[in-house]
């Protein structure tokens, strides 16, 4: 008799999830000498232990603590780039400006990027059919709780000037309900962080508006200022040109020397 299984509204666990996590861990630790001490099998066991046999709507940050401990990593706290709704460009940027780090440039972020996972209560099976959707089912699901946990820790580690890349093409350039708006903004430490610098990325070629004057950016400025952190905002009108200039700063059309 086929066992009844809860049908969730979201996509199921990414196929070959265990193999993918393990392979990513091995690759990351090979090219990052400061993480060579990490035992990837232990990392996978801790990852698995966070959600296997647990109800996928009942996951807590505590469940991820063994994984957090194994994945502890020091990144230069003054080189952190947060992002909201513009992940691809943020990652392209840290590929050409390698001294800056997004969460997905850290081991734990790299392991989980673009993956979905969940288990089932009281069985050791991984659910490849469906997983809870944050809105339609529950917020305390394995994926959401993981990103909330690692995002909080990442923001807490930041210091000096913290940068955030925001998508200027969206109706809400700053969205209070995004991971950045709901988790990271509130976990920056005012005693360590001097300034949050927002980079608003323009979408249209002819868009010359100052999106730093957008009401949602003003809302972000207000939230940050109330936390005793300075705020600055810059428009990046041509993201393609920006990336090219970051890569080749001596190009005559790019340079402004300091």
């Amino acid at each position: 008799v086929p066992r009844w299984r809860q049908q969730w509204s979201g996509p199921g666990t990414t196929k070959r999830f265990p193999e993918t996590v393990l392979a990513r861990c091995v690759k990351y630790t090979e090219i990052h000498p400061e993480m060579r001490h990490v035992d990837c099998q232990s990392v996978w066991d801790a990852f698995k232990g966070a959600f296997i046999s647990k109800h996928p709507c009942n996951i807590t940050e505590e469940d991820y603590q063994p994984l957090m401990k194994l994945g502890t990593q020091t990144v230069p706290c003054n080189k952190i780039l947060l992002w909201s709704r513009i992940k691809d460009l943020a990652h392209q940027f840290t590929q050409v400006q390698r001294d800056m780090f997004t969460l997905e440039d850290t081991l734990l972020g790299y392991l989980a990027d673009d993956l979905t996972w969940c288990g089932e209560f009281n069985t050791s099976k991984i659910n490849y059919q469906s997983c809870p959707d944050w809105r339609k089912d529950c917020s305390n699901n394995p994926v959401s709780v993981f990103w909330k946990t690692v995002s909080r820790r990442f923001a807490e580690a930041a210091c000096d000037v913290v940068h955030v890349m925001l998508n200027g093409s969206r109706s809400k350039i700053f969205d209070k309900n995004s991971t950045f708006g709901s988790v990271e903004v509130h976990n920056l430490q005012p005693e360590k962080v001097q300034t949050l610098e927002a980079w608003v990325i323009h979408g249209g070629r002819e868009d010359s508006r100052d999106l730093c004057q957008d009401p949602t950016i003003k809302e972000l400025e207000s939230i940050i200022s109330k936390r005793n952190i300075q705020f600055s905002c810059k428009n990046i009108y041509r993201p393609d040109k920006f990336l090219q200039c970051v890569k080749n700063p001596e190009d005559s059309s790019c340079t402004s020397e300091i």
Partner: antibody, heavy 127, light 108 residues
Framework: EVQLLESGGGLVQPGGSLRLSCTGF????????MSWVRQAPGKGLEWVAD????????YYADSVKGRFTISRDNSANTLYVQMNSLRAEDTAVYYC????????????????????WGQGTTVTVSS | QSVLTQTPSVSGTPGQRVTISCSGV??????VSWYQQLPGTAPKLLIF???QRPSGVPDRFSGSRSGTSASLAISGLQSEDEADYYC???????????FGGGTKLTVL
């Protein structure tokens, strides 16, 4: 023309002190991260210390930690290194250097290189 | 603390291409820069960010990077290229500069 001029070198006895200065011209000194690098006679380059643009972050080589202090006076466009408890092995030509940074579409980025160097000033520690 | 290792000396004849290597770059996120020091003068930046040339540096000089090693190539060797060449990297994790021991280039 972008230029750095060091001064303050000389002969000093072991255990003595010396302060080197480096004045910047032709660039916005306030925005520049600065370094001291030294070269012992017939030897290679050795980094000594680094300071952020506003002086709030300083970094030192293990060989000088606790004895040397890097500082800056942005109003005078001048970088300093105060050298105490000097030893014979501190004998070298001392160069100041500007850290390479660029503003790319108003975003300030660090390019992890020293793009302007002074002519050097010689420090001799001997009795 | 990491150490960058350079071949102590290389030589070549005018017009030739020579390569100077630098191994032991401790992290893929650390950039390598190269400096030329002519006899009796201060060092001069030749290459930054692994392979980028500052304006004013001839395109005969080129940098490359592969994992933990970097190299500086000089093509069309000229007598005025006779100098000491140093690789360096800022360790973004330890906040220290590390220099290679230098390579003496002799133009025969």
């Amino acid at each position: 023309e972008v230029q750095l001029l060091e001064s303050g070198g000389g002969l000093v006895q072991p255990g003595g002190s010396l302060r080197l200065s480096c004045t910047g011209f032709g660039f916005t000194f306030t925005d520049a991260r600065m370094s001291w690098v030294r070269q012992a006679p017939g030897k290679g380059l050795e980094w000594v210390a680094d300071i952020s643009s506003y002086g709030d972050n300083t970094y030192y080589a293990d060989s000088v930690k606790g004895r040397f202090t890097i500082s800056r006076d942005n109003s005078a466009n001048t970088l300093y290194v105060q050298m105490n408890s000097l030893r014979a092995e501190d004998t070298a030509v001392y160069y100041c250097a500007k850290r390479m940074e660029r503003e790319v579409m108003t975003i300030k980025l660090d390019y992890h290189a020293m793009d302007v160097w002074g002519q050097g000033t010689t420090v001799t520690v001997s009795s | 603390q990491s150490v960058l290792t350079q071949t102590p000396s290389v030589s070549g004849t005018p017009g030739q291409r020579v390569t100077i290597s630098c191994s032991g770059v401790f992290n893929i996120r650390n950039y390598v820069s190269w400096y030329q020091q002519l006899p009796g003068t201060a060092p001069k930046l030749l290459i930054f960010k692994d392979d980028q040339r500052p304006s004013g540096v001839p395109d005969r000089f080129s940098g490359s990077r592969s994992g933990t090693s970097a190299s500086l190539a000089i093509s069309g060797l000229q007598s005025e290229d006779e100098a000491d060449y140093y690789c360096a990297a800022w360790d973004i994790f330890l906040n220290v500069w590390v220099f290679g021991g230098g390579t003496k280039l002799t133009v025969l």
